[in-house]
């Protein structure tokens, strides 16, 4: 199935050019999306091209600038946030990245009523997190690991926590492992819907082992970066959840929310918090052995000034075939009765679907069903539930938005996006205004991305928000590769693949093949999305065929495929890449003497194991920032899929699944190993151990390190990296430079 039809006509052929590496590195063909910053049912904010903050009213059609670019520029602001009462705006500047989501910044408060910055009781700097209350203009912020509250922007702050300490106690922000592997946010505090209460997490990292690495910088002596980082089997953070009344916070102080008894009996995690009403909150907990999750609904008892979490409001989710949930345990979306909720979890057939829980999980009513998966619940209103799934035409790599009418019986289902721009758009996300009065659809492909605004009642398209016209024009004289998404059926396993083919692809010819792999649990690489990236260039200019294959362990095709890798990482993911390569060879257009594999992170692990599989299929390969042993990676992620590295649990497979154990098998392949020395996520230790094992086995290999670079290898390192990898592949495939 050709998803990106070639626009090449013979008469135009001589005006067309191939993609260059420079195009990719310069981001020449990057696209834009438009996500409205909703502030009501019918209004949104957007930062214009000239950096004014503009308020749009959909119903009146009017727009006006609420904050000028001059004001933004006066403090070098790169971001903003309007208070819900529309009296103040915070301006964010001096952005300083920490980990994946976290950063610190300087914040200024601008008073819209008098057009001046708030003077007196200014915020300290740098701040780790800051947010408005959902109503009015209270501010909560985290500074030096402690939480502060301002009743009004000009008021002095009230300190809520006092025990915050760098790398020891984190209040209102996650530690490294919770940020990366559990919450996927930079914050760990949550306002109640009307701002009466503020809930927050406290993470105690006192007993966690520390990863230390050198940051070379420019000084005479390198700095040492220390991060409390629990690797598999190590001591984990201790988490507690507190709630404070923000009206009179100095009176009762923070109240701890009790942990369900069945969770508290052994090591556990807190996984998410969802406010239901101002006096009802829902907490989700997870056992350290991550196959049991408990959802606990707690109520504020005014007479006791405490949070009560009755056992009757505890809902248990358990997996008998793998871990609980997909990548994360799903979060509930509460209905208007403030007690029942909608949630995605596995049905009896092992497909993730929406369920409606009114009293117990056992009595849950299944809302969606089929041999496909519901992926995200966007919004529940009085009469509709909006969700995304990959049901349409049975392509797991697509995303369409559906509406289920829950106000009528029986509920009716409508695909909102399936037929909108069918060729161009098969992968959507959505953003809803209050009460789903309006929504924006963002289409990511396979054609050029487009963002549109829609009426929440009729689903009618109101206007195009961003259609990437400039990109479309720029691509008119580019010979883009062809892309196809198909599937292989092998031993009752369906292997979906995406193949990227050179523009003048001819099935009768032989092409070098590059496999790009990620393959991590609950990931998906074969998606109907638009991209002009490095592999597009390799196909367009260098004439390579590139393939991406979703094997066992990948997501959105049912639990059988997903949980196949449970407690066995590094086995089936590799097998399935190899199986796919053999099938590609059978197709007749692959030069079997010129096959390579590359991957980053988990993909670096899989590519390394594939190269060391002893099949003789691969001539060469690249591993960027690979995991090399699961004992080196984070507890929360690793143990979810592998259990514990103990004798009575899964130590044997931890040992068997290392890259180092296969050092000898690299002898007959060309291997390029790449890692950033300041990788906080997959530590440089992983590649250091691979290199040591290869040296000890007297196996030749190539390596590149990037000094002071993290897991993303950003900035100038990116250019160097892709240039270096290009040279390596061209040399491997005997392509002229």
């Amino acid at each position: 199935i050709v998803l990106r039809p070639s626009r090449v006509h013979n008469s135009e052929e001589n005006t067309m050019r191939a993609l260059t590496l420079k195009d990719i590195l310069n981001g020449t063909f990057s696209y834009k999306t438009f996500f409205p910053n909703w502030i009501s049912g019918q209004e949104y904010l957007h930062q214009s091209a000239d950096n004014n903050i503009v308020l749009y009213n959909i119903e009146t059609g009017q727009s006006y600038t609420i904050l000028s670019n001059r004001t933004m520029k006066s403090v070098n602001a790169s971001n903003y946030g309007l208070s819900p009462d529309r009296q103040f705006v915070y301006l964010e500047s001096d952005y300083s990245k920490l980990w994946r989501y976290s950063y610190t910044a300087t914040y200024y408060i601008y008073d819209l009523s008098n057009g001046e910055f708030v003077r007196g009781n200014e915020l300290p700097r740098p701040i780790q997190y800051l947010c408005w209350s959902p109503v009015g203009s209270k501010l909560a912020y985290v500074y030096q690991n402690n939480i502060y509250l301002k009743q009004r922007p000009g008021d002095p702050p009230f300190q809520i926590t006092f025990n915050g300490r760098e790398n020891k106690i984190f209040n209102g922000i996650p530690d490294w492992v919770y940020e990366e592997e559990m919450l996927a946010t930079k914050y760990a505090l949550w306002w109640s819907p009307n701002g009466k209460f503020l809930a927050y997490a406290e993470f105690n990292d006192t007993d966690i082992p520390v990863i230390a690495y050198s940051y070379y910088g420019d000084e005479q002596y390198p700095r040492t970066i220390n991060i409390p980082y629990p690797k598999a089997g190590a001591k984990n953070p201790v988490v507690r959840i507190f709630i404070i009344d923000t009206t009179y916070p100095a009176y009762v102080g923070p109240q701890e929310v009790p942990v369900p008894a069945m969770i508290a009996s052994s090591d556990y995690y807190f996984s998410w918090l969802t406010w239901v009403t101002d006096e009802r909150v829902c907490l989700q907990w997870l056992k350290r052995v991550q196959n049991v999750s408990v959802l606990s609904i707690c109520d504020f008892r005014e007479d006791w000034q405490t949070w009560d979490c009755p056992k009757t409001q505890e809902h248990i989710e358990e997996s008998r075939t793998g871990w609980a949930g997909g990548f994360f345990v799903s979060t509930p979306v509460f209905s208007y009765d403030a007690i029942s909720y909608y949630k995605i979890f596995s049905d009896k057939d092992g497909y993730k679907h929406i369920h409606y829980i009114k009293d117990t999980v056992e009595n849950a009513i299944q809302i969606t069903s089929g041999k496909w998966e519901a992926i995200n619940i966007f919004r529940v209103t009085q009469d509709s539930l909006f969700y995304s799934s990959n049901e349409f035409e049975e392509y797991p790599g697509r995303r369409n938005i559906y509406r289920i009418s829950i106000g009528s019986y029986p509920p009716s289902k409508k695909c909102v996006t399936c037929h909108l721009r069918k060729e161009r758009c098969q992968y959507y996300t959505a953003s809803f205004s209050d009460y789903a009065k309006y929504y924006a659809l963002v289409c990511y492909g396979p054609g050029i991305p487009i963002s549109t605004l829609h009426d929440g009642r009729t689903d009618q398209e109101i206007k195009i928000l961003e259609e990437n016209k400039e990109l479309e024009n720029a691509l008119k004289n580019i010979q883009l590769p062809k892309e196809e998404i198909k599937k292989l059926e092998v031993d009752e396993i369906t292997l979906w693949y995406k193949m990227i083919l050179p523009p003048q692809f001819d099935r009768s010819k032989k092409y070098p093949l590059l496999i790009q792999v990620y393959g991590g649990p609950c990931s998906q690489s074969v998606r109907s999305v638009f991209a002009v990236n490095w592999i597009s260039y390799l196909a367009s200019k260098e004439g390579m065929v590139i393939a991406l294959v979703d094997g066992r362990g990948t997501a959105f095709q049912g639990d059988k495929l997903l949980y196949a890798v449970y407690r066995k990482l590094g086995v089936y993911e590799v097998e399935d890449q190899i199986t796919a390569v053999r099938k590609f060879i059978e197709m007749g257009f692959i030069d079997e003497k010129r096959i390579a594999i590359w991957g980053w992170s988990y993909g670096g692990y899989v590519s390394s194991l594939a190269l060391a599989s002893g099949t003789g299929l691969f001539k060469c390969g690249i591993a960027v920032a690979p995991v090399s042993s699961w004992e080196y990676y984070a507890s929360v992620y690793t143990e979810r899929f592998m259990g514990l590295p103990t004798k009575d649990d899964n130590l044997e497979h931890y040992k068997n699944s290392t890259v180092m154990a296969r050092a000898e098998y690299f002898r007959n392949v060309d291997y390029l190993l790449i890692h950033g020395t300041a990788d906080d996520n997959v530590h440089f230790q992983n590649s250091a151990q691979i290199a040591k094992a290869l040296v000890n086995a007297q196996v030749d290999f190539q390596a590149m390190w990037y000094s002071d670079q993290n897991h993303g290898l950003s900035g100038l390192s990116t250019n160097h990296l892709y240039t270096h990898m290009t040279h390596f592949l061209k040399q491997c495939f005997s392509l002229s430079d």
Partner: antibody, heavy 117, light 108 residues
Framework: EVQLLESGGGLVQPGGSLRLSCAAS????????MSWVRQTPGKGLEWVSA????????YYADSVKGRFTISRDNSKNTLYLQMNSLRAEDTAVYYC??????????WGQGTLVTVSS | EIVLTQSPGTLSLSPGERATLSCRAS???????LAWYQQKPGQAPRLLIY???SRATGIPDRFSGSGSGTDFTLTISRLEPEDFAVYYC?????????FGQGTKVEIK
């Protein structure tokens, strides 16, 4: 009806120790932060220490830090103040009060601590 | 720490008169964290006002509080005989919480 009843005060020599207790009733003791506030004869009020609902959250005035320890036993509905290395300037009526940093909506009747040789 | 200064030190008034007590903070205090107490000889303090202007349970409406930032006021609209006592303001904005030195309202 909320009641707070302090005990344990008395005469002690400088450098000595005393343990004050405060028995609480009429409210869910375990749900509230509690404080100790003292009043020197003929003088004003001075906050001494507070303890949060959750054990481990304790707060002290600089004048008593390292010498006094606040604690609570929720099973007994009792608040304590262990006072060591007492000084003459610690002489005061000690009140137990319901609340963290204020407002303090209920107070005990107070217990007199006299530090003198 | 925040120093609270109350004035006047003593206020001599007759029953039925209006009493205006002032409390000035050495630095800004958010109104949520300002309270007033009444203390009679031999008794413990009693909460009158919290949040600068909200009356505590059982407090007559002749007591009212106002103010923001650094200046706060307690007003007793018509003094009753039982109102003659010492009045303290208190802030809970910063640790340590602090009290004013007190204003004594005495019978003239």
């Amino acid at each position: 009806e909320v009641q707070l009843l302090e005990s344990g005060g008395g005469l002690v020599q400088p450098g000595g120790s005393l343990r004050l207790s405060c028995a609480a009733s009429g409210f869910t003791f375990s749900s509230y932060a509690m404080s100790w506030v003292r009043q020197t004869p003929g003088k004003g009020l001075e906050w001494v220490s507070a303890i949060g609902v959750s054990t481990g959250s304790t707060y002290y005035a600089d004048s008593v830090k390292g010498r006094f320890t606040i604690s609570r036993d929720n099973s007994k509905n009792t608040l304590y103040l262990q006072m060591n290395s007492l000084r003459a300037e610690d002489t005061a009526v000690y009140y137990c009060a319901k609340g963290w940093l204020g407002p303090f909506d209920y107070w005990g009747q107070g217990t007199l601590v006299t530090v003198s040789s | 720490e925040i120093v609270l200064t109350q004035s006047p030190g003593t206020l001599s008034l007759s029953p039925g008169e209006r009493a205006t007590l002032s409390c000035r903070a050495s630095q800004s205090v958010s109104s949520s964290y300002l309270a007033w107490y009444q203390q009679k000889p031999g008794q413990a303090p009693r909460l009158l006002i919290y949040g600068a202007s909200s009356r505590a349970t059982g407090i007559p409406d002749r007591f009212s509080g106002s103010g923001s930032g650094t200046d706060f006021t307690l007003t007793i609209s018509r003094l009753e005989p039982e109102d003659f006592a010492v009045y303290y303001c208190q802030q809970g904005q910063l640790i340590p919480p602090t009290f004013g030195q007190g204003t004594k309202v005495e019978i003239k």
